[in-house]
Interface confidence: low
Amino acid sequence: MRWCLLLIWAQGLRQAPLASGMMTGTIETTGNISAEKGGSIILQCHLSSTTAQVTQVNWEQQDQLLAICNADLGWHISPSFKDRVAPGPGLGLTLQSLTVNDTGEYFCIYHTYPDGTYTGRIFLEVLESSVAEHGARFQIPLLGAMAATLVVICTAVIVVVALTRKKKALRIHSVEGDLRRKSAGQEEWSPSAPSPPGSCVQAEAAPAGLCGEQRGEDCAELHDYFNVLSYRSLGNCSFFTETG
């Protein structure tokens, strides 16, 4: 009964009924990706074209819950995966110590209000080391050339900008520290030991509506999707788990 609101469900989630009206948002993902056995990979999804508020993001593999990033409670990593899954960056997920068995479909499930649920799909193929290395041989020279070119261009741009702004005594504050600040408690949370609000979200190219006023901080504004929709008190029965 993933909750009778699709309620209880989610795993977790598990989904509240969608509000009426069109779901205009779209999920952009990294698509089909490959990685080397034993290595790491970052799974990333991005919700755009909607002003809906993101309240929780679930990461799942096939039918297994990997992790949940809840706006209020932060990250929860499923006990079965906590040794090999790390939260972030942002709303993404990092898979470590990859094995061939990790090959398969991964889903990012965005719980939003009032739109409901958006799901993105990523297919990961974990390659044997020799295969990955073979592909890398062809990429390294090209990447090296591109990097060298970029360094030259960037240096020139920096010099020009520096000379242009030299006369201005304006002090420009960098927001980089805010954007990259890792908030405390990016570990699994439970009812008994919640991590700080919004610890899972950093405003790194965050879509509109995700972090309220886009302050470059954690997204504590994400309200619990379930509470808002009376999901956790609530909406669909299967919500207790999550809807399909």
């Epitope: 009964m1 209880i8 598990r14 819950l65 299967s238 999550e242």
Partner: antibody
Framework: EVQLVESGGGLVQPGRSLRLSCAAS????????MHWVRQAPGKGLEWVSG????????GYADSVKGRFTISRDNAKNSLYLQMNSLRAEDTALYYC??????????????WGQGTTVTVSS | DIVMTQSPLSLPVTPGEPASISCRSS???????????LDWYLQKPGQSPQLLIY???NRASGVPDRFSGSGSGTDFTLKISRVEAEDVGVYYC?????????FGQGTKLEIK
């Protein structure tokens, strides 16, 4: 083996309280939503309450709202149902149940054997 | 609240013959994600209920393929292609779309 074992049922007078417990084993308890479903003698099934894996989402049937409280202790792999202000119509066999999935909805795939609650003066 | 109505309430069947149970909801159980949030459960005499079908038409693990679920929106059907003696019991449909979840009254299947 996946198992749910209910306890705490018994005979109680109207207006009194009772606390049901459900001990879960054989699966990762804190990955799944749980529910209580009851069945009055000779009657059909009635969903009573549900709770998400992280206790954030909670739902109740109208007939028990304000009187019953569902909770869980993931560290103890346990589900609870605190029943206050009991009425004769709460007399039933109470089942502890588990959601079948944690991404999509897969129905309620595991049911305990139930514990009997009798409310009578 | 969503009200679930089953018919018939009693269903005598000859072993080997097909059986069909209808379940109707007071409002659509079709979620915008394309799934119908309707399950079927069987409670055999003296036992706890067991899941047969979830999301309208998906057979639960271990359920014989003679059981099938169909329908969408407000009208659903559970079919047993060839009834066996072990299929005796009360069949319930349950909506999982909105809280509170709700069950039908149950259909008692008995062998003629």
């Amino acid at each position: 083996e996946v198992q749910l074992v209910e306890s705490g049922g018994g005979l109680v007078q109207p207006g009194r309280s009772l606390r049901l417990s459900c001990a879960a084993s054989g699966f990762t308890f804190d990955d799944y939503a749980m529910h209580w479903v009851r069945q009055a003698p000779g009657k059909g099934l009635e969903w009573v309450s549900g709770i998400s894996w992280n206790s954030i989402t909670i739902g109740y049937a109208d007939s028990v709202k304000g009187r019953f409280t569902i909770s869980r202790d993931n560290a103890k792999n346990s589900l609870y149902l605190q029943m206050n202000s009991l009425r004769a119509e709460d007399t039933a066999l109470y089942y502890c149940t588990k959601d079948g999935g944690n991404r999509r909805y897969y129905g309620v795939d595991v049911w305990g054997q139930g514990t009997t609650v009798t409310v009578s003066s | 609240d969503i009200v679930m109505t089953q018919s018939p309430l009693s269903l005598p069947v000859t072993p080997g013959e097909p059986a069909s149970i209808s379940c109707r909801s007071s409002q659509s159980l079709l979620h915008s994600n394309g799934y119908n949030y309707l399950d079927w459960y069987l409670q055999k005499p003296g036992q706890s209920p067991q899941l047969l079908i979830y999301l309208g038409s998906n057979r639960a693990s271990g359920v014989p393929d003679r059981f099938s679920g169909s329908g969408s929106g407000t009208d659903f059907t559970l079919k047993i292609s060839r009834v066996e003696a072990e299929d005796v019991g009360v069949y319930y449909c349950m909506q999982a779309l909105q809280t509170p979840c709700s069950f039908g009254q149950g259909t008692k299947l008995e062998i003629k």
